[in-house]
Structures are given as C-alpha cells and as structure tokens.
C-alpha cells in the first residue's frame, strides 16, 4: 500500500513542496515519485519513506508516489493547487470629468490568479462596493453602470480582487486597480452672457463681462475671453454656481475693423461658447479751420469743417450743403465777431450707432478804440463836495489804455470815488489807445456851488 | 547503502588554503544536496553552506562568504569545499552532510588545522 | 539570522529516567526543527526531522514536539547508549543554525 503526505496542498506559484511518499512493506523493490517538476530527495535512512522537494511548481500538478512490494504496485496521488493573485487587476480608461445625470460604465479587467474558485472581482466606490461577482473568464470581466450624481464629485472608484484562500488555511490575498477619480460636472446648456460695447473707438478701453451660472463645480470653470486674436485676462468672480470674468479690452488702428469677441466657457469636457461682433472705429474730432484766428474788423474770415470722410457734418448747427463731411461760411469779421466761437459737430454711423464728435475754435477780432457818448458821457454836472465817480468806458480789442487830461497833466479819476471840488472843473481830453489806433474825446465837469441864503 | 567518505586531516598554515573532498556512495549527487557543518573543538556544530549538485548553486553562510567554494563533481559523484585565507579559528572538524533541509547521513569529518 | 537556544546545557540523569530537552528559536520557524545526536568523536546522526517526524531505524524512545519558537526533544526511558550531546538545528531561513547543544551526562 503507498501512502502520500500530504495528500492536498495549496501553494504560491513558483513554490517548492515537500511530498513524502510512504510504503507499508519493509521492502520495497521500488519507492519513487513520479512528476514533471524539478525534485530533490531528501535522503532519509531507512526504504519505506522517502521526501521530495518538488520545486518551481507553476501550475496545478499531481504527483504520483509509486511503490512496488512483493504483494504487487500500488500508487497514490497528492493534490498541489497553485495560487497567485492576479497580474492585472485594472479599470478600463474613462474620461476623469463626466456630466451629472450621465450613466457611466465602470468595467474592471483581471488578467490571471489562481484558483478562480477563490477569486472574487469587487467594484467600489470609495469603500462602497457597487458590484460583486467571481472571476470568469481570461481576462475576467466585471461592470457596472452608475448614474453620476453631483455628490460623486472626487469620489475614487476602483477594482479589487480577493483571492480568499482562508478555507484552505492562508489568508485573503486582496489587489486593487489604481483609483479613477470622477470629476463629476455640470455646465448649463445656455451659453454665457456677455456683455461688451458693440463699438470701440481705436486707442481707448473697453470693459467685456462674461458670466454664467448654474455650473458645478464653478471653481473649476474656465473662462477663455478673446478679441480677435487678443487673448483678455479677465478678473474673474466666483459665486455659489456661477462666475462673472470682467477683463479691459485696449484697441489700436491695427484692430480697425469687425473683430469677433468671444467668451469660451469649458467645464469638464465640454464647452459653450458665445460669439459677439465689435466693430473697431478711428473717428478723429472733426477740424474747424479759420482764415486766421485772429483778424481785424471787416476782414473777409472762412470757416471751414472737415471731418471724417464717411461722417456728416453741421457747422454752427447748420448742415453741410450737401450733407457730407466737410463745411464751410464766410463772413465780415465785426467788432460783434469777437470771441465767437464757431462749433462744429460730426457724425458718424458705426454699426448702426451714431457717433458724436465735436470741435470749436473762437475768433479774435482786433477793432476798436472806441470812446461814444454811452459810455463816456460828455458833460457832468456835479454839485460841490458831492461824492462822484467819474465814468468812461473805452471799447476795443485789444482794450484800449484810457487816459483823461485837463490841460494835458490833470487827471480825471476814471472809476474812482472822489469828493467834488472846484478844482475838478473843467474840459478834460480822454484818449483811448491801443495797437489798433487812438481816438480822444472832450468831457467836460460842471461843478455847481452851494447856495447860502 | 548510503555513505560519505571524506579526505584525511590537513594542517595548513594561517593564510593558506584547504580543499576536503567528500566522495558519495549509494545514491546520486545530483538528487539532493550536500550540506558542510564544521565543529571546532569542543564546541557546537556550525553550518558552512550548502551546494546542489545538479545546477552548482550555492548558499554560503554570511560569516564565511568570500573565502568558501563549494563545487561537485557529478562524474565521480564528488563534493568539494575549498576554505582559502584560513585563520587559526578555522581550526575545526569538517563534515559533508547529504539531504536537504536536515542532515541524515554524514561523512566521517575531516580535521582542518590551521597553525603557524 | 535566527538565534537557537537550547537549555538545559547540561544535564545527569539515570538509565530509564524521562529526559526532556528544549529548543527555542529567535523567531517563529513553523515545524522546520531536526534533531541531532552526536557521541565523542563521531559525526552527528539524525534523530527527529521536522519537529516530530521520526526516523527509521532509531528507537521509538526518542520523540519530537513543537511548532513555532518551542520544541521537545523527549527520551522517554533514558539507556546507556544515549549518554551524548543533542542538538537542535533550524531549516526556516539561511544560514541554517544549530542550538548550542544540551550534554546528557551520567548521573
């Protein structure tokens, strides 16, 4: 009768086993093993036992102890059972972000492990398991569908295999997939508002806001504004679910022209995107032009406006003849012409908006000096030791120098309150001069005396 | 049957080296394992290394490695040690031991001594 | 490398008393423990190989027990002939190590 011990044995793959192999005669003529796998003997004295060290053991395998004895061969058989836990324990690839509301395949591939029987593949989320089933198959295959939720943001899913070889005596061989973090996210299907000027005059600053809410997780929201091929760099907000991205926008000639704005919102992997045109204008203020500024009375003076080839201009409210961007009148300058000024306004149409531009120049008229009765009255007549003051008015651009002599060295006070006194009496010769001439005028002061009675 | 015989005593100076042979009976080197133990005298016993003759692999014990070689000889079914900068506490009987991971049959021993 | 200490180093004792050595080793070594006997002059032989397994062609009187760090050599009615030194040997890990022997004197 051979024996075998052990007669079942669980090992790792790539073990070595110790097997020995028993006869209950005394004498057996042969006591061996037979086995494909590398072995040793592990002398022993006597003949009715003998140990092998089988080694290298990669596979279930069943070695057979023979003997031959004088009452006939007899054999017996032990069970070696290799275990290992798998080579490959991994969540097929899946985007990191997916959108709220989404169904979501998770599927976990096992390549090997051994013996399937004690393999058990779970899926889980976070320390949730979500799906249990054994391992079938090579590579064994497990899924499971889940509806992402907002709450799932961050969680880690991932695959484990257990390789439970407790019943046999060992322990619970456990081997997890790398984690697959969702992103969970949800971007609205409105696209984001932008608000921005429709036009924008060349060498100034604008201000574009795009925003949009009802997005999760908004702190990851990205915000891309650009004019053209300017990319902006907007100074961006964040609510609860919604974010506002606020950025200057600077023009220059080389921008002149319909440019596209666009504010591109990505979340996740997805984007919505709103597209805005900007028209790009130069509209210089119109030029007022006059013969000279500076003209003397009765000079013929031209004003002239001239504007931006595409604008319509109105020269002191009154429009071109015909509408168009230049105008100009013609006129006698008089001393009333003096400080006019002459205001010319433009207009110009971009994008359907009317744009408004203006100038105004002033014209100096150099007249004068003038001296009438008006304002230099000829004849005063004042009572004695009244308190008076002596008037006289000289008009003329520039403004004339007055000066008012009795006999060529007496002063009369111009403007100033005096006490009336015979000495004030008399003929006085007023001259007001200036770059433009003199003229002189005769002002007499009467003073009359006090009556006694 | 089963025996191990061993070369003859050897006296070796210090620095010198020694090669004790050990010259198997009864059974095929190459189906298990030759195992050295040394004892130095009146002490315990002390595990050198071990060989296997199929494939020549060795395992030496940490506190000899570098100065012991073991080698086989399947032809004439002969086991080799070779302890080379001997030093005087290498004094000891050497013996070849066969089996695996306990030593059922031993040789007869041969004393190293290593004296100046 | 696992350490083997065997106690006690020494004992005497009389023909067909009941002799018990043990063996402990540094660590857990599972039942990978053999047994030695070895006489003045002699080369060890081989007694018990792991822990309890016994050898053909040595008396029945010799047992092994034990697993993990503690181990029995037990000769249950001692006779002349084993007055000798015993050693306990480790085949857990490399290097493999013995006890340092317990001598079994006459009493």
């Known amino acids: 009768q051979t024996s075998v011990s052990p007669s079942k044995v669980i090992l790792p793959r790539g073990g070595s086993v110790l097997v020995t192999c028993s006869t209950s005669c005394d004498q057996p003529k042969l006591l061996g093993i037979e086995t494909p796998l590398p072995k040793k003997e592990l002398l022993l004295p006597g003949n009715n036992r003998k140990v092998y060290e089988l080694s290298n053991v990669q596979e279930d395998s069943q070695p057979m102890c023979y003997s031959n004895c004088p009452d006939g061969q007899s054999t017996a058989k032990t069970f070696l059972t290799v275990y290992w836990t798998p080579e490959r324990v991994e969540l097929a690839p899946l985007p990191s972000w997916q959108p709220v509301g989404k169904n979501l395949t998770l599927r976990c591939q096992v390549e090997g492990g051994a013996p399937r029987a004690n393999l058990t593949v779970v899926l889980l989320r976070g320390e949730k398991e979500l799906k249990r089933e054994p391992a079938v198959g090579e590579p064994a295959e497990v899924t499971t569908t889940v509806l992402v939720r907002r709450d799932h943001h961050g969680a880690n899913f991932s695959c484990r295999t257990e390789l439970d070889l407790r019943p046999q005596g060992l322990e619970l061989f456990e081997n997890t997939s790398a984690p697959y973090q969702l992103q969970t996210f949800v971007l609205p299907a409105t696209p984001p508002q932008l608000v921005s000027p429709r036009v924008l005059e060349v060498d100034t600053q604008g201000t574009v806001v795009c925003s949009l809410d009802g997005l999760f997780p908004v702190s990851e929201a990205q915000v891309h504004l650009a004019l053209g091929d300017q990319r902006l760099n907007p100074t961006v907000t964040y609510g609860n679910d919604s974010f506002s991205a606020k950025a200057s926008v600077s023009v220059t000639a080389e921008d002149e022209g319909t440019q596209r704005l666009t504010c591109a919102v990505i979340l996740g992997n997805q984007s919505q995107e709103t597209l805005q045109t900007v028209t790009i204008y130069s509209f210089p203020a119109p030029n007022v032009i006059l013969t000279k500024p500076e003209v003397s009375e009765g000079t013929e003076v031209t004003v002239k406006c001239e504007a931006h080839p595409r604008a319509k201009v109105t020269l002191n409210g009154v429009p071109a003849q015909p509408l168009g961007p230049r105008a100009q009148l013609l006129l006698k300058a008089t001393p009333e012409d003096n400080g006019r000024s002459f205001s010319c306004s433009a207009t110009l149409e971009v994008a359907g908006q009317l744009i408004h531009k203006n100038q105004t120049r002033e014209l100096r008229v150099l007249y004068g000096p003038r001296l009438d009765e008006r304002d230099c009255p000829g004849n005063w007549t004042w009572p004695e030791n009244s308190q008076q003051t002596p008037m006289c008015q000289a008009w003329g651009n520039p403004l004339p120098e007055l000066k008012c002599l009795k006999d060529g060295t007496f002063p009369l006070p111009i403007g100033e309150s005096v006490t009336v006194t015979r000495d004030l009496e008399g003929t006085y010769l007023c001259r007001a001069r200036s770059t433009q001439g003199e003229v002189t005028r005769k002002v007499t002061v009467n003073v009359l005396s006090p009556r006694y009675e | 049957q089963v025996q191990l015989v061993q070369s003859g005593a050897e006296v070796k100076k210090p620095g010198a080296s020694v090669k004790v042979s050990c010259k198997a009976s009864g059974f095929n080197i190459k189906d298990t394992y030759i195992h050295w133990v040394r004892q130095a005298p009146g002490q315990g016993l002390e595990w050198v290394g071990r060989?296997?003759?199929?494939?020549?692999?060795?395992i030496y014990d940490p506190k000899v490695q570098g100065r012991v070689t073991m080698t086989a000889d399947t032809s004439t079914n002969t086991a080799y040690m070779e302890l080379s900068s001997l030093r005087s506490e290498d004094t000891a009987v050497y013996y070849c031991?066969?089996?695996?991971?306990?030593?059922?049959?031993w040789g007869q021993g041969t004393l190293v001594t290593v004296s100046s | 490398d696992i350490q083997m200490t065997q106690s006690p180093s020494s004992l005497s004792a009389s023909v067909g008393d009941r002799v018990t050595i043990t063996c402990r080793a540094s660590?857990?070594?599972?039942?990978?423990l053999h047994w030695y006997q070895q006489k003045p002059g002699k080369a060890p032989k081989l007694l018990i190989y792991?822990?309890?397994q016994s050898i053909s062609g040595v008396p029945s009187r010799f047992s092994g027990s034990g697993s993990g760090t503690d181990f029995t050599l037990t000769i249950s009615s001692l006779q002349p002939e084993d007055f000798a030194t015993y050693y306990c040997q480790q085949s857990n890990s490399w290097p493999y190590t013995f006890g340092q022997g317990t001598k079994v004197e006459i009493k």
């Open positions: 660590q857990s070594i599972s039942n990978n």
């Open positions: 031991a066969a089996s695996g991971y306990w030593f059922a049959y």
């Open positions: 060989i296997d003759p199929a494939n020549d692999n060795t």
């Open positions: 792991h822990a309890s």
